[in-house]
Amino acid sequence: QEEDLPRPSISAEPGTVIPLGSHVTFVCRGPVGVQTFRLERDSRSTYNDTEDVSQASPSESEARFRIDSVREGNAGLYRCIYYKPPKWSEQSDYLELLVKESSGGPDSPDTEPGSSAGPTQRPSDNSHNEHAPASQGLKAEHLY
């Protein structure tokens, strides 16, 4: 009998509000034994996979998807899904990435603290939309 796979989680480092031109890394987490992580975007058809999976803890594995220079087109909803043979998990909740103009003011922090919860986390409709776009293991640049 196949095991029930836990839903993955998604977070963003250093946060979910990123100044234009700065970098952001999406972190997808799942159980140990994950072969492939896929990062998808709502409403876009692009995606990427990575098999560069590391062990984050004795019970958890993770993959990181980095965008070196965030553009306005990177704003939007992102989610993760993973493949642990012989099947895919459900999707994670959506994480919303916000892109803001660089203010440069010393009183305004560049980013929010990294978080996988809070107002930027949205439920993913797993009944149908298994199929939104995604991003890659090392770089996630073409998820515009």
Partner: antibody, heavy 115, light 111 residues
Framework: SVKESGGRLVTPGTPLTLTCTAS????????IQWVRQAPGKGLEYIGA?????YTYYASWAKGRVTISRTSTTVDLKMTSPTTEDTATYFC?????????????WGPGTLVTISS | ELVLTQTPASVSAAVGGTVTIKCQAS??????FAWYQQKPGQSPKLLIY???KLASGVPPRFKGSGSGTEFTLTISDLECADAATYYC?????????????FGGGTEVVVK
């Protein structure tokens, strides 16, 4: 590559299963769609098996066909075909990195439904 | 159900000329869109996807544009080898499933 098989001449109402066989890539990562083309007509979408195990059908195909997959194949079962189902049937795999385009197509398999 | 209306049904142009084919979707489909070329007796060939990215091996004479509901395929510097039927397709699998649908096709005749 992908290649269709199972096309043949059958009488109306005779169930028929077409198979799309994948080689040279890991099928688990990809969506596979089935498309058909009646003689002299345009392309008609039948349905798809997505990488995550979901199956979708065109509205006209619901109840008329069933799509299923294994680790290396995606089957299209025609439950009770009629003469209107005579066509060349294609399967296709989406492009790496983008769900919107299907770059890998099989040569097609001809299905003839006739009494 | 999603409908893709492709125009014109047929178009003729001279070698070296330009052809424009349009595809209108009945609902917004974002970037879930592609153009294919098919010649008699052959399988369809992916030209453009996403909906402006050139598929591998396709010359830049082929250009795709648009998003949402309006899409355009432009073929410039027409060659005899471009004579074929061209189809648009949406393969959107969203929360409100729109599915895979083809346009009716456009026959391109090169004079």
């Amino acid at each position: 590559s992908v290649k269709e098989s199972g096309g043949r001449l059958v009488t109306p109402g005779t169930p028929l299963t077409l198979t799309c066989t994948a080689s040279g890539f890991s099928l688990y990562k990809y969506n596979i769609q089935w498309v058909r083309q009646a003689p002299g007509k345009g392309l008609e979408y039948i349905g798809a098996s997505t990488y995550a195990g979901y199956t979708y059908y065109a509205s006209w195909a619901k109840g008329r066909v069933t799509i299923s997959r294994t680790s290396t194949t995606v089957d299209l079962k025609m439950t009770s075909p009629t003469t209107e189902d005579t066509a060349t049937y294609f399967c296709a795999r989406h492009i790496d990195g983008d769900y919107s385009g299907y770059a890998l197509w099989g040569p097609g398999t001809l299905v003839t439904i006739s009494s | 159900e999603l409908v893709l209306t492709q125009t014109p049904a047929s178009v003729s142009a001279a070698v070296g000329g330009t052809v424009t084919i349009k595809c209108q979707a009945s609902q917004s489909i974002g970037t879930w869109f592609a153009w294919y070329q098919q010649k008699p007796g052959q399988s369809p060939k992916l030209l453009i996807y996403g909906p402006s990215k050139l598929a591998s091996g396709v010359p830049p004479r082929f250009k795709g544009s648009g998003s949402g509901t309006e899409f355009t395929l432009t073929i410039s510097d027409l060659e005899c080898a471009d004579a074929a039927t061209y189809y648009c397709q949406s393969t959107y699998f969203g929360v409100d499933y729109l599915g895979g649908t083809f346009g009716g096709g456009t026959e391109v005749v090169v004079k």
